[in-house]
């Protein structure tokens, strides 16, 4: 006869491990007992359980409540046992010794591998600002046994670096994603992908990139100079910019206070019917937590009675 077992039994943390040991005997042969022991190199054998043809199952005190026989029906030549709720410390070498009649004793070894699935965590780097050099966008850490694989899934251009820390029964892997921040990255997903044999599918954690920036400011509304004449209604100036975080707008007049009747509505400056007192230099001040920008325009309200043409100067400052 001969023993049938597995070289390696792989189980996920918390699951039950079936340790197989089947005696393939000739007709008339009987199994008297099957003794299971843990036999890690450098340590003495630690008894696990005994399956005895007459006495039944004995579980050694160290494994009390954790070892069972597989559910019926059972073959008397089957010495397999179930190790309940596998923990990392169970990982190692196991031996089954089968005493048969009349063929004598047989033994076989197997290795129990306990997979510890990772619980990944993603940590964003420092605040990203346009104009910075290569900057840490995020780091992703996953610890498991065996060591997990940590990669990144993103459309954003960047570089990755990984490092690994080995512990007694597991390994922690940290991967960092670096990039040169630009406004085009704003709102883009950066996904950490963790692969591990103990996972049914990859684990993914997504971080949305936020890059602080503030675009140059410009003012619209003076494109057609001839429209800015006395009596015109609905004249307005609109300040154009964009940023992250979204900027706030403030309007001032360089050469005095805003004329009465002029309405400030965020990025828009609305005028009542134009008069010559609306002529002047107007400044749009755009700001967010990252930066601030100014843009100024000169408004010259024309009197249609006058022949001279309207002059408009546009000046942008930051």
């Amino acid at each position: 006869g001969e023993l049938e077992t597995s070289d390696v039994v792989t189980v996920v943390l918390g699951q039950d491990a079936k340790l197989p040991c089947f005696y393939r005997g000739d007709s008339g042969e009987q199994v008297g007992q099957v003794a299971w022991a843990r036999v890690d190199a450098g340590e003495g054998a630690q008894e696990l359980a005994l399956l005895h043809s007459k006495y039944g199952l004995h579980v050694s005190p160290a494994y009390e409540g954790r070892v069972e026989q597989p559910p019926p029906p059972r073959n008397p030549l089957d010495g397999s046992v179930l190790l309940r709720n596998a923990v990392q410390a169970d990982e190692g070498e196991y031996e089954c010794r089968v005493s048969t009649f009349p063929a004598g004793s047989f033994q076989a070894r197997l290795r129990l591998r306990v997979l510890v699935p990772p619980l990944p965590s993603l940590n964003p780097g420092p605040a990203l600002e346009e104009g910075q050099g290569l900057t840490l966008a995020a780091s992703c850490t996953a610890e498991g046994s065996p060591a997990p694989s940590v990669t990144w899934d993103t459309e954003v251009k960047g570089t990755t670096s990984s490092r690994s820390f080995k512990h007694s029964r597991s390994a922690a892997v940290t991967s960092e994603f670096h990039l040169v921040p630009s406004r085009s990255m704003n709102g883009q997903p950066l996904t950490c992908v963790v692969s591990h044999p103990g996972l049914l599918q990859d684990q993914r954690i997504t971080h949305i990139l936020h890059v602080s920036f503030l675009a140059e400011a410009s003012v619209r509304g003076l494109e057609d100079q001839n429209l800015w004449h006395i009596g015109r209604e609905g004249a307005m100036l609109k300040c154009l910019s964009e940023g992250q975080p979204p900027p706030s707008y403030n309007w001032t007049r360089l050469d005095g206070p805003l004329p009465s009747g002029v309405r400030v509505d965020g990025d828009t400056l609305g005028f009542p019917p134009l008069t010559t007192e609306h002529s002047g230099i107007y400044v749009c001040h755009v700001s967010n937590e990252f930066s601030s920008r100014d843009s100024q325009v000169t408004v010259d309200v024309l009197d249609p009675q006058e022949d001279s043409g309207k002059q408009v100067d546009l000046v942008s400052a930051s």
Epitope: Q33, E47, L50, Y55, G56, H58, S60
Partner: antibody, heavy 126, light 107 residues
């Protein structure tokens, strides 16, 4: 025929020592675990100690741990029990017994005692 | 330690009677149980091992049953030589422990 013959019992004062012997014959002594079991007058049976065939492993009852030592001399087919610091409650008939050898290579369980000696009386009294 | 509780502690019976003695373990012991017979002034004698296996040379009127925590020794037809004290013993764990004994007396 399997035979187990104890000797060495007698009267001893509290705190004293005694060494019991058990001469075995009729079986391959080294193949068997051997045990000592005692029985106080008018009382039930109490396991005292066991020792494996190659003398590498032994077990003791809590009540005798640190005071009694089990040993064997396989060349003489003899089992011993060295009893020190004896107390009145150690008074009993001491039996030497052979374990039924139908469990092999597994020390976490004991097996039934299939052969017993006739016993030797130990009396601890002042 | 595993406690073994026998009942009854004594019983009176006549020759030819069917006698049943029970033994309960304080925790599961599979079939790691033996029964012994002891007569006054004599050493115990193994009757049953593995809860139900008859030791060689023991009359077939003795039988054992049970597994886990509850066990029974039955003498199907009591004979004069069967009047003695009977002990159960678990050998599942160290220390092996005995029941307190059941004395079978002549009615």
């Amino acid at each position: 025929e399997v035979q187990l013959v104890e000797s060495g019992g007698g009267l001893v004062q509290p705190g004293g020592s005694l060494r019991l012997s058990c001469a075995a014959s009729g079986f391959n002594f080294t193949d068997y675990w051997m045990s000592w079991v005692r029985q106080a007058p008018g009382k039930g049976l109490e396991w005292v100690s066991s020792i494996i065939g190659d003398d590498s492993t032994n077990h003791y009852a809590d009540s005798v741990k640190g005071r009694f030592t089990i040993s064997r001399d396989n060349s003489k087919n003899t089992l011993y029990l060295q009893m020190n610091s004896l107390r009145a409650e150690d008074t009993a008939v001491y039996y030497c017994a052979r374990e039924y050898s139908d469990v092999v290579d597994y020390v976490s369980v004991r097996t039934p005692l299939d052969y017993w000696g006739q016993g030797t009386l130990v009396t601890v009294s002042s | 330690d595993i406690q073994m509780t026998q009942s009854p502690s004594s019983l009176s019976a006549s020759v030819g009677d069917r006698v049943t003695i029970t033994c309960r373990a304080s925790q599961g012991i599979s079939s790691y149980l033996a029964w012994y017979q002891q007569k006054p002034g004599k050493a115990p004698k193994l009757l049953i091992y593995a809860a139900s296996s008859l030791q060689s040379g023991v009359p077939s009127r003795f039988s054992g049953s049970g597994s886990g925590t509850d066990f029974t020794l039955t003498i199907s037809s009591l004979q004069p030589e069967d009047f003695a004290t009977y002990y159960c013993q678990q050998h599942y764990t160290t220390p092996p422990t005995f029941g307190q004994g059941t004395k079978v007396e002549i009615k």
